[in-house]
């Protein structure tokens, strides 16, 4: 099931997926002056079985100089419902994230691809936020958002990362200092937290993700 909305926008922060759930689509976008090859794939699709996941289809771009247009390729109408845009970055998957069963790694770049990637995320997808350069997180640890299905509707949990100005860039998971805790709310020392938001507290009574008060139960 595709997620109905984009991941939340957090002031002075960007998000990135560390691994992509099966069913995720990545539009085959080309940079200005190039177009998708004739009969080329519209998108790459993360598919797989119980032991291995990979991207089906390959994106290919060719020069559009011979055609009377430099228009950038956009998704077909049926694809335009979900446009998840992330800036192109070098893959930063921690091993435990990228090797998750049922997940694909960041697809390698293709020649003349667009500067931004447009993903169509599925329920269960997790993205991580970091403060942009010049800003620093008030709290320590990764800020996450997960696409969930609730009452028949999809929604992204709210990370509420607070990035304050004139500070150095914070880090993505995998580059964290040891013992990092989720962004935003004080977390119980005995609990395991998947998604967090500022203004939330998890108490020590919360021993599992499903019984986490404030955080998991109400997102």
């Amino acid at each position: 099931e595709l997620c109905d909305d984009d991941p939340p926008e957090i002031p002075h922060a960007t998000f990135k997926a560390m691994a992509y759930k099966e069913g995720t689509m990545l539009n085959c976008e080309c940079k200005r002056g190039f177009r998708r090859i004739k009969s080329g794939s519209l998108y790459m699709l993360c598919t797989g079985n119980s032991s291995h996941s990979s991207w089906d289809n390959q994106c290919q771009c060719t020069s559009s100089a011979t055609r009377n247009t430099t228009k950038q390729v956009t998704p077909q109408p049926e694809e335009q419902k979900e446009r998840k845009t992330t800036e192109m970055q070098s893959p930063m998957q921690p091993v435990d994230q990228a090797s998750l069963p049922g997940h694909c790694r960041e697809p390698p770049p293709w020649e003349n691809e667009a500067t931004e990637r447009i993903y169509h995320f599925v329920v269960g997808q997790m993205v991580y936020y970091q403060c942009v350069q010049g800003y620093r997180a008030l709290h320590r640890g990764p800020a996450e958002s997960v696409c969930k299905m609730t009452h028949g509707k999809t929604r992204w949990t709210q990370p509420q990362l607070i990035c304050t100005g004139e500070m150095e860039t914070s880090q993505f998971p995998g580059e964290e200092k040891p013992q990092a805790s989720p962004e935003g709310r004080p977390e119980s020392e005995t609990s395991c937290l998947v998604t967090t938001t500022d203004f939330q507290i998890q108490t020590e009574m919360a021993a599992t993700m499903e019984t986490s008060i404030f955080t998991t139960e109400y997102q």
């Epitope: 002075h12 709290h139 709210q158 935003g184 119980s188 500022d198 507290i201």
Partner: antibody, heavy 114, light 111 residues
Amino acid sequence: EVQLLESGGGLVQPGGSLRLSCAASGFTFSSYGMHWVRQAPGKGLEWVSVISYDGSYKYYADSVKGRFTISRDNSKNTLYLQMNSLRAEDTAVYYCAAGVPDYWGQGTLVTVSS
Amino acid sequence: QSVLTQPPSASGTPGQRVTISCTGSSSNIGAGYDVHWYQQLPGTAPKLLIYSNNERPSGVPDRFSGSKSGTSASLAISGLRSEDEADYYCAAWDESLNGPVFGGGTKLTVL
């Protein structure tokens, strides 16, 4: 259970000093930004100061800048507020708050009067 | 003067629905920061009532709901009860202050 317990309040003369403490338990104190928020008698909430999880940066409300200093000792799970050059208008209940902020202590009363 | 603007008072009879507004600016609510609501009963510390615009912490009845649009937000209380009589504050991070800002508070009276 998450707990924040303030102490150090009391009666002080104008121009005097006080140091408030906030003992935290029940969560990973060293991972979260902490705040001081105050409430004058019969008035609303006013944010005073914030300190980042590692103490590397601090911000203050204009009304206390240059007079108050926020600090923390992560090894003791304790937040502090050093208040100097106190004025009558600083009279309030001072709350320690965790997050941005969601969980609050019960507060400690600071009275500045001659 | 508070950075976020709330009506000083609101009232309703038991069972009624009451709405409290909160207006901010481009440096707080309008900048994309979430709005949070607190309930403060007489003589007690503020308690988180709504977080991230419309989420309820565990134990908060679904009679309480929140919403946000542009530079404003609102708290709605349906099925008003006598125990809802309290002061209500909105809050949001403000990037010009690098700290949270609060509304002046709304005193809710249940008639």
